[in-house]
Interface confidence: medium
């Protein structure tokens, strides 16, 4: 049997912890240092944990050593400390902070935990938020004090200030659009809403401190986007309200966003705001929600997708049992990272239940969704018979899946950074989620997919998508299965003597490592945890070669489709070449621009779709009040402005070039003179002269690029 | 620099007419809507109606349908605007102003404004 | 018609304070995700002076103390700090249909 053969796969450490927590929070310090931090603690979810135990490892998982003694309150103290979480700093990997759940203590470290100091601070870490470029600087929350307050400590948590009360929630502003140690905070107001306030020295003096939104619901803060909700109340109504979206994209004043819709909002969700536009769920007062994207700037959103699966306590699903499991919303929306574009969603048609959901996935961000192709043939090789005109097709596990299924917890669909393309599922083929699970791949960006592996698995990948690794789920088993060809194949290593429980499959994040930490249990009766790394360099063989890249696009698997006029070419390394890309591979990608076609346009401002939706052509709106063509006012002669044909360049679209875009864009002329005498055009190869009749001057037109200049036109009218 | 320059004030008797004119500098009045609005004293505005001077069609308010009408001469750079049959609730300070493409309908630029005044 | 209700009619506030007004449309000025609705000041003797057009663009030269907000049919004014210059009347106007028509005016006193 292949256990053996000399195996490719080694397990290179293996240690028992003697640890009954019933969680295990992991942290690899990254930056190619071997620490590995764990702390386990009990379930969070009902109460505070009544003990915790850490552990460091400093050879990336081989041995784990117990640190808890060290996390005491001083002399004469025998008090054990209590760890509900401990924070990395994302400035300095040698730094983390363990804060106690009940004490105001917290404990640092400035040397990858190998001393740790103690120090009694003036409240209680509920959350802490540490700076990402300054390391001293972190921000600290009072979540149980009556008067929610915020705290500051610039000596990386040994003294602290207050610095707000009241506090709903808080940030750090986000480079580079804010300036350096901004803060945003949410503030409770007597009304019951709240402020949003930013503030660049820490509320120390008004000068800095600027009110961003006033009587806000929520709000929150996104890379280039901010976002919050309002209450409005409807005209003529006392009882029905509805809420608003306010955005700001690039840190202007917040806006409220417009909504094609007749129904009431109760409330947003946002989905997505990582490409330079918006994906909002809205959620209407019929319990069902919509999925809504924006142009750039996030304030005018139109309707992509109906009837997308979104929970929410207390709105959408709080009367199912989901509310017993879910205190945060969430939607089953899912970005194909790595790419632009390309997302999955779940439908959902009646109750939240698995037989009413369906998944649907978009390669234009959203312009039209499809369900997903189901894949030919089983892992053994028959055929499935499933057609799409049937209604059958392949659906595809996601956050409401995993609720659904407490005792054998579904996996997230996994897609990332370092496999553009490749993504693995939990999911079943028919006409909804209900059938049967297995595990999905697809390598070519949701376009085509095949079913991997049967029943429900753990799954994780190393070495940029180089090889896969999974273990099944709801068994014990001593069975690690992995491929290096993208899923096509898989073998076998048996990775203990004994079945151990597992209870996860993790690789260091960023997943260009080769090697796998396998988290279970080995005590028949008691659960104790139980960590074994698992290395896989050797199943890759060498080094990759320039000859075992290909280079692919997305745009290959939809007949070389542009999106948003770019189409974007990736290194590949070919799924049946056996060696491994390293841990510094650097994937190139070329994004090369395509020609524009008319789907690269919309109608530009006072302009709709003529009534003959085939020509696709945009015409004059009879509705729109304003003067079409007109130059702006003031428009000094000499200089020149954009007149609109009444297209635009859809936002974000890169495309150039071609008929399309001649035809279509707006054209630069020359700014009109403001009182006209009669006069002569006449044209001398390289430029176009204007004789004024009345006084006899001459002057040339600010016109560039001519060439042979042999006839010319003049519009009269503009 | 654009401006709309106005008529100087004017003194009628009921039943009269007046015409009113409105000179714009620095930009072609073609490339815009000239409208006209109506101040009584005291009071707000209200929007009498506007001329597209590219090709003279013009948009009224109902409620000066008839009372009011609004010409331009590009030559000039000029618009009009010609009130008939006055009476006292015609007094008023009467504005010129411009829109265009740019400004989605909101009005820019304006006139220093005529005063009307219809009196026995 | 569109008719545009004003509130309040008169407004009294501090100097450094926040003034805000309202402006409400018996049917909606939103044209495709645009809202033509726009904000001008007029003191007394001189012409109306735009200062926000389409809901909340400030036109530029307005000092950044004004701001315009709102969507649909509802809309508002602020003017934060208020200083003695603003002392004003304040009319909103739609271009979403003709003919286009003014609110009824607030007069932004100093308390």
């Known amino acids: 049997s292949a256990a053996l053969q000399p195996e490719p796969i080694k397990v290179y450490g293996q240690v028992s912890l003697n640890d009954s927590h019933n969680q295990m929070v992991v942290h690899w310090a990254g930056e190619k240092s071997n620490v590995i931090v764990a702390l386990a603690r009990d379930s969070l979810a009902l109460a505070r944990p009544k003990s915790s135990d850490v552990y460091v490892s400093y050879d990336y998982g081989k041995s784990f050593k117990k640190i808890s003694d060290k996390l005491n309150f001083g002399l004469g103290n025998r008090s054990e400390a209590v760890i509900a979480q401990f924070y990395h700093s994302p400035a300095d990997n040698k730094r983390y902070i363990f804060a106690d759940a009940y004490a105001q203590y917290l404990w640092i470290t400035f040397d990858f935990c190998n001393t740790l100091q103690g120090f009694s601070i003036p409240f209680r870490a509920a959350d802490l938020l540490l700076h990402s470029k300054a390391s001293n600087l972190l921000l600290g929350f009072d979540r149980s004090h009556p008067n929610k307050q915020l705290w500051k400590s610039d000596d990386f948590g040994q003294t602290w200030i207050m610095i707000q009360e009241h506090v709903k929630s808080f940030s750090w502003g986000i480079d580079p659009y804010d300036k350096p140690n901004t803060i945003y905070i949410e503030r409770h107001e007597p009304s019951g809403y709240s402020t949003v306030f930013r503030s660049t020295d820490f509320f120390q003096s008004r000068e800095n401190q600027e009110v961003i939104l006033e009587e806000v619901r929520d709000f929150q803060l996104r890379d280039k986007y901010m976002f919050a909700t309002k209450v409005v109340h409807l005209l003529g109504s006392e009882q029905q309200s509805s809420v608003q979206l306010w955005v700001s994209f690039g840190r202007k004043p917040m806006r409220a966003a417009q909504f094609v819709t007749r129904h009431p909002i109760n409330e947003y969700y946002i989905a997505d705001a990582s490409e330079d536009q918006v994906f909002v769920c809205v959620s209407h007062s019929n319990n069902r929600t919509n999925l809504y994207i924006s142009e750039a700037e996030g304030l005018k959103f139109s309707l992509s997708l109906e009837n997308v699966l979104y929970y929410s306590p207390g709105g959408a699903g709080s009367d199912t049992l989901v509310r017993y499991f879910a205190n945060e919303p969430f939607a089953d929306f899912h970005r194909v990272e790595g790419l632009q574009g390309v997302y999955i969603a779940t439908l959902i048609n009646g109750s939240m239940n698995e037989e009413n959901m369906r998944s649907v996935i978009t390669f234009d961000k959203g312009g039209t969704w499809e369900f997903l192709q189901a894949p030919a043939f089983t892992g053994y090789g028959e055929k499935i018979n499933c057609e799409l005109s049937q209604g059958c097709s392949l659906h595809l596990a996601q956050r409401l899946s995993q609720l659904l299924n407490l005792q054998l917890r579904r996996m997230p669909i996994l897609s990332k950074e370092s496999a553009p393309g490749l993504i693995i599922a939990t999911g079943s083929v028919g006409k909804n989620l209900a059938s049967k699970t297995n595990v999905y791949i697809s390598s070519s960006a949701g376009a085509r997919w095949r079913e991997a592996l049967p029943g429900p698995h753990y799954y994780t990948w190393g070495d940029h998508g180089g090889i896969i690794t999974a273990i099944a789920q709801g068994m014990e088993t001593n069975e690690l299965k992995y491929s290096t060809n993208e899923g096509e194949t898989w073998k076998t290593f048996i990775f203990s003597e004994k079945p151990v429980f597992v209870y996860g499959l993790l690789t260091e994040p960023g997943e260009k490592s080769t090697v796998f930490t396998i988290f279970g249990s080995n005590k028949e009766n008691v659960h104790s945890w139980l960590i074994l790394q698992v290395n896989a360099t050797d199943a890759l063989g060498v080094p990759c070669t320039e000859n075992d890249y290909k280079l692919w696009s997305p745009s290959d698997e939809r007949g070389n489709e542009c999106l948003l006029g770019h189409k974007t070419v990736f290194k590949r390394r070919t799924p049946h070449a056996t060696c491994f890309n390293g841990e510094d591979f650097d994937r190139p990608v070329v994004v090369s621009n395509c020609s524009c076609t008319r789907e690269d346009y919309e109608c530009d401002f006072g302009f709709k779709m003529s009534e003959d939706l085939s020509l696709e052509v945009c015409v004059p709106d009879p509705e729109f009040s304003g003067k079409s063509y007109s130059p702006p006012v003031p428009c000094p002669v000499g200089s020149t402005y954009r007149r609109t044909r009444g297209y635009r360049k859809i936002s974000g679209d890169t495309c150039s070039g071609g008929d399309v875009e001649a035809r279509l864009e707006g054209e630069l002329v020359p700014c009109p003179l403001a009182e006209e005498n009669e006069f002569i055009l006449y044209a001398v190869r390289k430029s176009i002269y204007r004789y004024d009749l009345a006084s006899g001057a001459t002057e040339q037109l600010p016109l560039t690029g001519l060439r042979a200049a042999v006839a010319l036109d003049f519009d009269y009218e503009h | 620099e654009v401006q709309l320059q106005q008529s100087g004030a004017e003194l009628v008797k009921p039943g009269a007419s007046v015409k009113l004119s409105c000179t714009a500098s620095g930009f072609n009045i073609q490339d815009t809507y000239i409208h006209w609005v109506k101040q009584r004293p005291e009071q707000g505005l209200d929007w009498i109606g506007r001329i597209d001077p590219a090709n003279g069609n013009t948009k009224y308010d109902p409620n000066f349908q008839g009372k009011a009408t609004i010409t331009a001469d590009t030559s000039s750079n000029t618009a009009y605007l010609q009130l008939s049959s006055l009476a006292s609730e015609d007094t008023a300070v009467y504005y010129c102003?411009?829109?265009?493409?740019?400004?989605?309908?909101?009005?820019?630029?304006w006139g220093q404004g005529t005063s009307v005044t219809v009196c026995s | 018609d569109i008719v545009l209700t004003q509130s309040p009619a008169s407004l009294a506030v501090s100097l450094g304070q926040r003034a805000t007004i309202s402006c409400r449309a018996s049917e909606s000025v939103e044209y495709y995700g645009t809202n033509l609705m726009h904000w001008y000041q007029q003191k007394p003797g001189q012409p109306p002076k735009l200062l926000i057009y389409v809901a909340s663009t400030v036109k530029s030269g307005v000092p950044a103390r004004f701001s315009g907000s709102g969507s649909g049919t509802d809309f508002s004014l602020n003017i934060h700090p208020v200083e003695e210059d603003d002392i004003a009347m304040y009319f909103c106007?739609?271009?979403?249909?003709?003919?286009?028509?003014f609110g009824g005016g607030t007069r932004l006193e100093i308390k």
């Open positions: 102003a411009t829109s265009n493409y740019y400004s989605r309908g909101a009005m820019d630029y």
């Open positions: 106007q739609q271009s979403r249909k003709v003919p286009w028509t």
